[in-house]
């Protein structure tokens, strides 16, 4: 009785389509499949970023995987074929692993690479980033911003950049059509006539880096005689209220401050007759339900109340 | 739909060089290995070289070892074939043709006809 | 090198008429043989790939079998369109090799 064997699939290589981080993994099948024409062969991928504890595994039945890296640093992978036991009467065979590696060849020393990114997605309608310049570089040094997500057909350059002494320290972006959940793919480069500048890459999600606007039309309503109901809206723009979290920060009388975080556009307040004076400012944040991070907004204008009108049923500013 | 465009055709003399090329479109290029192969006036079809997707992996037939390489650009989506010390035995139509998923070829490109004579 | 092998290498067929081309490779290639059509003055076209399994847009009186060193391609009806050269190739292990060709033509 014969060991059963399987040869690893061929032609194992990761492929850069230019999509700065968004990388394909493709093999081709093992030879000499003639056993096992009635059975559905499978593989198991394993691959990571150099530097990383963890694989990530994968079995499939196709001959290719994609998935995001990061390109400051090298990937790795292996793959193997894999028999299961319905094909070889009991358990499962395995062939030896086919391994590849990529990386990109990095040019220049680390410190030429931008400082200090920033990406910030405004009202969850224009992104902004901006960077420094590496140190020690040049005034001739200028920084070429590129981008990716999936639904574009190649890597577009930054057409409105920010710029400071002529060199370009950030980029505005234009209309992102369907590019929110899921992975922001930039590269930041350089070019010198001086010395080799180092390229930079950058993944993140746009929820994550959302924001806001701050609330507005802060209002004072009247429940009883010691509850004050504080009210706003939410900013203009695109963000349903079911995504909101806010903060409220409230002065009474310029000694007491009361911070809160609530999930809704109210918040009630006990009061005394005593209290004199009222302040409250609200900022707003995505919360979790829509977004596994994100950025407060600026404090909303400051509303006030002063005086006896506190007993009346409505103030407004 | 997928394309698959050769350069033109080419006369050289015996022992030139000549670089064909093959541009594709209608598919995502660097996810297939791309392959040519050759006929000869009234002869069979004969493989010249293939490379992966990626262009990691090239193979050749002992016949063009070393004399042909076969190179790929994934940025403009065009596969090459560079020829040196050309014989007259190289005189044929050259096809590219795209490697399916299975490792079968399965679009050609129209072909070009290299003709090698003094 | 695997040799493959080609029968007839002229086959004269009535229209409407069946047609069977055969192939053998010299050794064992499993499922990994492909059949090509070229029509005069044409590219090579696809029909065939993994012995048995015919491409989209290939009419289905086309018709592969065969596997390890027998194979077998198989036109149920011939039509005028079909006239040309047909090609076996294996592509188990390199370097590839093609058939020598199987000229079909209307009697």
């Known amino acids: 009785d014969t060991e059963i064997k399987v040869n690893p699939p061929q032609d194992f290589e990761i492929v850069d389509p230019g999509y700065l981080g968004y990388l394909y993994l493709q093999w081709q099948p093992p030879l000499s499949l003639d056993h096992f024409k009635e059975c559905t062969v499978e593989y198991e991928l394993k691959y990571r970023n150099i530097g990383s504890e963890t694989w990530k595994t994968i079995i499939t039945k196709n001959l290719h995987y994609k998935d995001g890296f990061d390109l400051n640093k090298g990937i790795e992978a292996k793959i193997h074929t894999l028999l299961p036991w319905q094909c070889t009467n009991g358990s499962e065979v395995q062939s030896s692993w086919a391994e590849t590696t990529y990386w990109i060849s990095p040019q220049g020393i680390p410190e030429t690479k931008v400082q200090d990114m920033d990406c910030v997605y405004y009202n969850w309608q224009y992104l902004l980033c901006s960077w420094k310049p590496g140190i020690g570089v040049l005034l001739d040094t200028n920084y070429n911003l590129f981008y990716w997500y999936e639904g574009l057909d190649h890597a577009l350059q930054c057409v409105d950049y920010i710029k400071a002494d002529g060199q370009n320290i950030g980029c505005r972006f234009p209309y992102l059509e369907a590019s929110d959940y899921k992975d922001f793919y930039i590269c930041v480069n350089g070019s010198s006539e001086n010395k080799p500048i180092r390229s930079s890459y950058f993944t993140f999600q746009l929820q994550n880096i959302v924001k806001p606007l701050p609330p507005v039309y802060l209002t004072f309503t009247r429940e009883s005689s010691c509850e004050i109901k504080l009210k706003w809206s939410i900013p203009l723009g695109p963000i349903p209220a079911r995504c909101f979290d806010y903060e409220i920060e409230i002065r009474e009388d310029d000694t007491t401050l009361v911070t809160a975080t609530v999930e809704n556009e109210t918040y009630t307040l006990k009061t005394t007759n005593e209290t004199r004076q009222l302040c409250f400012v609200v900022r707003s944040k995505v919360n979790i339900y829509c977004s596994d991070d994100g950025i407060w907004s600026e404090w909303s204008d400051k509303q006030c109340w002063e005086g006896e009108d506190l007993s009346k049923k409505t103030l407004l500013r | 739909q997928v394309k698959l465009v050769e350069s033109g055709a080419e006369v050289v003399k015996p022992g030139a060089s000549v670089k064909l090329s093959c541009k594709a479109s209608?598919?995502?290029?660097?996810?297939?290995?791309m392959s040519w192969v050759r006929q000869a006036p009234g002869q069979r079809l004969e493989w010249v070289a293939t490379?992966?997707?990626?262009?990691?992996?090239?193979y050749y037939p002992e016949s063009v070892k070393g004399r042909f390489t076969i190179t790929r650009d994934n940025s403009t989506s065009t596969l090459y074939l560079e020829m040196r010390s050309l014989r007259s035995d190289d005189t044929a139509v050259y096809y590219c043709?795209?490697?399916?998923?299975?490792?079968?070829?399965?679009?050609w490109g129209q072909g070009t006809l290299v003709t090698v004579s003094s | 090198d695997v040799v493959m092998t080609q029968s007839p290498l002229s086959l004269p067929v009535t229209l409407g008429q069946p047609a069977s081309i055969s192939c053998k490779a010299s050794?064992?290639?499993?499922?990994?043989v492909a059949w090509f059509q070229q029509r005069p003055g044409q590219s090579p076209r696809r029909l065939i790939y993994?012995?048995?399994y015919r491409y989209s847009g290939v009419p289905d009186r086309f018709s592969g079998s065969g596997s390890g060193t027998d194979f077998t391609l198989k036109i149920s009806r011939v039509e005028a369109e079909d006239v040309g050269v047909y090609y076996c190739?294996?592509?188990?292990?390199?370097?590839?090799?093609f058939g020598q060709g199987t000229k079909l033509e209307i009697k």
């Open positions: 190739q294996q592509y188990n292990a390199y370097p590839l090799t």
């Open positions: 043709a795209r490697r399916d998923l299975r490792s079968a070829m399965d679009y």
């Open positions: 993994s012995a048995s």
């Open positions: 490379i992966s997707g990626g262009g990691s992996y090239t």
């Open positions: 209608g598919f995502t290029f660097s996810s297939y290995g």
């Open positions: 050794q064992n290639v499993d499922i990994n």
